[in-house]
Interface confidence: low
């Protein structure tokens, strides 16, 4: 015996209150697959969330965050406050990175500067709250008589053009 609900397309629900006919999803609800026995309530992008894609009868709304906030979690389930570069978000708000750490983004935590000496290299450019140190050639390479080495270009984030 075929389940009569299996004939209900996306955008409808199998309405047991009405002898299992396929009723259209009411306003502000959707069903993204066929054979659903209920429509899901559309996500509402309220407060710090803003609507990236409107809800339709067959797909949920999608949210992102208002300026000054960024998405966290699957499907932007949370919005977290942005901080400036050189800061991290704590329970008490945005705080400057401690000495020896940096954050080059508006989100995330401050991370320790690279320890150049672990790779046998020297510090070419000192770190700041916003930028990691730049490691240069090993101290041995800088001894008198060594051939000259072209300093590497400063590191930059992928996808960003040079300043």
């Amino acid at each position: 015996l075929q389940d009569p609900c299996s004939n209900c397309p996306a955008g409808t629900f199998c309405d047991n209150n009405r002898n299992q006919i396929c009723s259209p999803c009411p306003p502000n609800s959707f069903s993204s697959a066929g054979g659903q026995r209920t429509c899901d309530i559309c996500r509402q992008c309220k407060g710090v969330f803003r609507t990236r894609k409107e809800c339709s009868s067959t797909s949920n709304a999608e949210c992102d965050c208002t300026p000054g906030f960024h998405c966290l979690g699957a499907g932007c389930s949370m919005c977290e406050q942005d901080c400036k570069q050189g800061q991290e978000l704590t329970k008490k708000g945005c705080k400057d990175c401690c000495f020896g750490t940096f954050n080059d983004q508006k989100r995330g935590i401050c991370r320790p500067w690279t320890n150049c000496s672990l790779d046998g290299k020297s510090v070419l450019v000192n770190g700041t709250k916003e930028r990691d140190v730049v490691c240069g050639p090993s101290p041995a390479d800088l001894s008198p008589g060594a051939s000259s080495v072209t300093p590497p270009a400063p590191a930059r984030e992928p996808g960003h053009s040079p300043q």
């Epitope: 047991n16 209150n17 009411p26 026995r37």
Partner: antibody
Framework: QVQLVQSGAEVKKPGSSVKLSCKAS????????INWVRQAPGQGLEWIGN????????NYNQKFKDRATLTVDKSTSTAYMELSSLRSEDTAVYYC??????????????WGQGTLVTVSS | DIQMTQSPSSLSASLGERVTITCKAS??????LSWFQQKPGKAPKTLIY???RLVDGVPSRFSGSGSGQDFTLTISSLQPEDIATYYC?????????FGGGTKVEIK
């Protein structure tokens, strides 16, 4: 806040009819099913039927199909249940309760205070 | 109509004790089962729907499990305010039908 307020207690003779009311407030009346459930003294719960105020679509428990009539007055956000040919075993507390649009996610989330109907000669 | 058999019909338990009530459907009802609590002279109150989904505001000591034909309501640690009669309700098919109830008392 959401409220379902039912009419007062009734004493009826066998063979007569009774019409109970359930006035809704605090929500969009037409968007929720109104269900009627009864409970005989010291007994369990029994579903009588439901009605969708938006289009007055009704479902009845077969046991009550011939005797119960569910109606609504959208202008006053009131649901009614009329039960005819009363007999002594209809003595019970009658509750109205709402469920939302999607039957399969139903929750009887708000209930009226109940109306006691006593059928006695 | 689908028959709902609830057991036990009554039970006595100590405060803090774990309490389990079962409900058996006469046929497969998927997960379309609710649990209600009713105190004397009051309307029932829905605790759980879809077999295991807790209604907002219901204490987390209440939990539901099961699917198909066999379902369980558990109170993890019985409190004085839990003294009541509990009913299950199937709504897989019209008409919805209730179990006979389980009266929970303090030992």
């Amino acid at each position: 806040q959401v409220q379902l307020v039912q009419s007062g207690a009734e004493v009826k003779k066998p063979g007569s009819s009774v019409k109970l009311s359930c006035k809704a407030s605090g929500y969009t009346f037409s968007s929720y099913w109104i269900n009627w459930v009864r409970q005989a003294p010291g007994q369990g719960l029994e579903w009588i039927g439901n009605i969708y105020p938006s289009d007055s679509y009704t479902n009845y428990n077969q046991k009550f199909k011939d005797r119960a009539t569910l109606t609504v007055d959208k202008s006053t956000s009131t649901a009614y249940m009329e039960l005819s040919s009363l007999r002594s075993e209809d003595t019970a507390v009658y509750y109205c309760t709402r469920t939302w649009e999607f039957y399969y996610d139903s929750v009887f989330d708000y209930w009226g205070q109940g109306t006691l109907v006593t059928v006695s000669s | 109509d689908i028959q709902m058999t609830q057991s036990p019909s009554s039970l006595s338990a100590s405060l803090g004790e774990r309490v389990t009530i079962t409900c058996k459907a006469s046929q497969d009802i998927n997960s379309y089962l609710s649990w209600f609590q009713q105190k004397p002279g009051k309307a029932p109150k829905t605790l759980i729907y879809r077999a295991n989904r807790l209604v907002d505001g219901v204490p987390s000591r209440f939990s539901g499990s099961g699917s198909g034909q066999d379902f369980t309501l558990t109170i993890s640690s019985l409190q004085p305010e839990d003294i009541a009669t509990y009913y299950c309700l199937q709504y897989d098919e019209l008409p919805p039908t209730f179990g006979g109830g389980t009266k929970v008392e303090i030992k």
